[in-house]
């Protein structure tokens, strides 16, 4: 009987040693995993930062084809919005096509919902013609719906799926646009 108990005790001790070993192995494995994770994260970080240096658009800008877009998180009047874009080497958004309009409105829906965003469109005070920032005229399908009854100067903005007009001195978000960096490969 005593021999039996002693054998059981030895088996239990053996089990305990095995469990301790397993625990030790697990701890070691966990530590190694953590180190590998750290290494992987550092590598990812490195890759990301080097990719960032040659990425087509700056951080926080959205890319579509050859253009990069920045959706502001602050409100300003049209003129100040334009200056804010200039500081970034960009202009207020110039919509060239229905495809671009669809991309912008689709992106805005995802980012912020239905707010007003200044674009680079203003009405010439003398002729009443709409002009983009670069002096060109918008295509007929991209003329703002007459919404502003203001006697003041009116500028263009995007809201939901529409291009509208408003007094340039009202406060809105804005969208900047610049060319995406061409790959030098």
């Amino acid at each position: 009987k005593l021999l039996q108990v002693s054998t059981i005790a030895m088996q239990q001790q053996e089990k305990l040693i095995q469990q301790e070993r397993a625990l030790l192995n697990f701890t070691e494995w966990k530590r190694s995993c953590a180190l590998q994770m750290k290494y992987c994260q550092a590598f990812m970080q490195n890759s990301l930062s080097s990719a960032h240096n040659s990425s087509p658009c700056p951080n926080n800008w959205i890319q579509n084809r050859e253009s990069c877009y920045y959706v502001s998180e602050i409100w300003s009047i049209w003129h100040t919005s334009q200056e804010n874009c200039l500081k970034e080497g960009s202009t207020l958004l110039q919509i060239e096509s229905k495809e671009e309009m669809d991309f912008i409105t689709g992106s805005l829906r995802k980012i912020k919902g239905s707010y007003d965003y200044w674009v680079g469109l203003s009405q010439d005070g003398h002729s009443g013609r709409w002009l983009w920032q670069d002096g060109s005229s918008p295509s007929p399908g991209l003329l703002p719906a007459e919404r502003s009854q203001s006697a003041n100067q009116v500028c263009g903005y995007v809201k939901s799926n529409s291009l509208l007009s408003s007094n340039c001195s009202t406060w809105k978000y804005f969208i900047c646009e610049k060319y995406a960096l061409r790959s030098s490969v």
Epitope: I77, W78, H79, Q82, L86, Q123, G135, V154, C168
Partner: nanobody, 116 residues
Framework: QVQLQESGGGLVQAGGSLRLSCAAS????????MAWYRQAPGKRRELVGG???????GYADSVKGRFTISRDNAKNTAYLQMNSLKPEDTAVYYC??????????WGQGTQVTVSS
């Protein structure tokens, strides 16, 4: 009536420099941002860079480090200093401004040709 007049364009060898001026009249120059654009034959007019009313500047990636924009409010003039010019910088260069009211104005442009 606001008027803008560019000058300083011309023919230059690749690697050379040019300084363009944009003189403004009929506007409170100091409160307006000034932008420089360029248009190569058959291409859309593109932003080169700009200077805001407080003197902050921004540049298109294609000219960063080579072009510098400055302004002299006393002379109502903005400048575009172009160094290390490349054949692909060949274009008509325009200056433009927008007033706080939202009016936009343009100069007639000045031709810059860079030969290789």
């Amino acid at each position: 009536q606001v008027q803008l007049q560019e000058s300083g364009g011309g023919l230059v060898q690749a690697g050379g420099s040019l300084r363009l001026s944009c003189a403004a009249s009929g506007t409170l120059f100091s409160i307006n941002g000034m932008a420089w654009y360029r248009q190569a034959p058959g291409k859309r007019r593109e932003l080169v860079g700009g200077i805001t009313s407080d003197g902050s500047t921004g540049y298109a990636d294609s000219v960063k480090g080579r072009f510098t924009i400055s302004r002299d409010n006393a002379k109502n003039t903005a400048y575009l200093q172009m160094n290390s010019l490349k054949p692909e910088d060949t274009a008509v260069y325009y200056c433009g401004t927008s007033t706080p009211r939202g009016d936009s104005y343009w100069g007639q442009g000045t031709q810059v040709t860079v030969s290789s």
